[in-house]
């Protein structure tokens, strides 16, 4: 008799999820020699243990602590790049600017980026049919809790000047409900972080507006200032040129504003 299975509103676990996580872990430790000591089988076991046999609407940060412990990694605290709604450009930037790191450049972020996963209460099965949607089903689902946990830890680790890349094409350039707005902003440590510098990325070719004057950026400045952290903001009018100039800073066209 087929067992009744909970139907959730979100897509199911990414196909080949266990194999993908394990392979990404192995590749990461190969690319980053400082993480060679990591036992990827143990990492996968801890990852699996966080959500398997648990109700996918009842996951806690505590469930991920064994994984957090195994994935502990020291990144230079003054080289952290946060982002909101502009992931691809942030990742392109850190591929070129090798001494800066997004969350997805760390082991745990690299393992999970763009994947979905969930289990079922009281069975050891992974649910490949559907997983809870944050809005329609529940917020304490395996994926959301994972990103909340690693994002909080990443922000807590930051020091000196922290950069954040924001999407100037969105109606809310700063969104209080994004992971950046709801988790990372509130977990920057004022005793360690001197300044949050926002880079507002322009989308349009002819867009010369000063998006640092946008009301949502002013709202971000207010939140940050109240936390005793300084705030600064820069417009990146030409993201393509910006990347090119990060790659080749000596290029003569890179002295002008980007």
């Amino acid at each position: 008799v087929p067992r009744w299975r909970q139907q959730w509103s979100g897509p199911g676990t990414t196909k080949r999820f266990p194999e993908t996580v394990l392979a990404r872990c192995v590749k990461y430790t190969e690319i980053h020699p400082e993480m060679r000591h990591v036992d990827c089988q143990s990492v996968w076991d801890a990852f699996k243990g966080a959500f398997i046999s648990k109700h996918p609407c009842n996951i806690t940060e505590e469930d991920y602590q064994p994984l957090m412990k195994l994935g502990t990694q020291t990144v230079p605290c003054n080289k952290i790049l946060l982002w909101s709604r502009i992931k691809d450009l942030a990742h392109q930037f850190t591929q070129v600017q090798r001494d800066m790191f997004t969350l997805e450049d760390t082991l745990l972020g690299y393992l999970a980026d763009d994947l979905t996963w969930c289990g079922e209460f009281n069975t050891s099965k992974i649910n490949y049919q559907s997983c809870p949607d944050w809005r329609k089903d529940c917020s304490n689902n395996p994926v959301s809790v994972f990103w909340k946990t690693v994002s909080r830890r990443f922000a807590e680790a930051a020091c000196d000047v922290v950069h954040v890349m924001l999407n100037g094409s969105r109606s809310k350039i700063f969104d209080k409900n994004s992971t950046f707005g709801s988790v990372e902003v509130h977990n920057l440590q004022p005793e360690k972080v001197q300044t949050l510098e926002a880079w507002v990325i322009h989308g349009g070719r002819e867009d010369s507006r000063d998006l640092c004057q946008d009301p949502t950026i002013k709202e971000l400045e207010s939140i940050i200032s109240k936390r005793n952290i300084q705030f600064s903001c820069k417009n990146i009018y030409r993201p393509d040129k910006f990347l090119q100039c990060v790659k080749n800073p000596e290029d003569s066209s890179c002295t002008s504003e980007i």
Partner: nanobody
């Protein structure tokens, strides 16, 4: 399924040069990388060099300054220019495509490089 086609191997004298090519059926994008590994008889396969989508490179210490990896994204091709070859560079050279999203390594059939006088 990514297909890889290697070429350019052969026999060369110490101090000589070779250029390996590898054409992929899919372009390098996002966090995918292409690279070259080698396996000498009785030894484990080891990384020689890899290149990411934006031209970022990694090299094994043993080949730094002698080998250069490059790519032509328009042709989905990665090259390995090998100069000042040494007998210890003798191995089968394998083209590798790491597909980040799928968490999969794809491999070419391998091309033999022999450095001998």
């Amino acid at each position: 399924q990514v297909q890889l086609q290697e070429s350019g191997g052969g026999l060369v004298q110490p101090g000589g040069s070779l250029r390996l090519s590898c054409v992929a059926s899919e372009r390098i994008f996002s966090r995918n990388t292409m690279g070259w590994y080698r396996q000498a008889p009785g030894k484990q396969r080891e990384l020689v060099a890899r290149i990411a989508s934006l031209g970022i490179t990694n090299y094994a210490d043993s080949v730094k300054g002698r080998f250069t990896i490059s790519s032509d994204n328009a042709k989905n091709t990665v090259y390995l220019q090998m100069n000042n070859l040494k007998p210890e560079d003798t191995a089968v050279y394998y083209c590798n495509y790491w597909h980040y999203a799928a968490g999969r390594d794809y491999w070419g059939q391998g091309t033999q490089v022999t450095v001998s006088s």
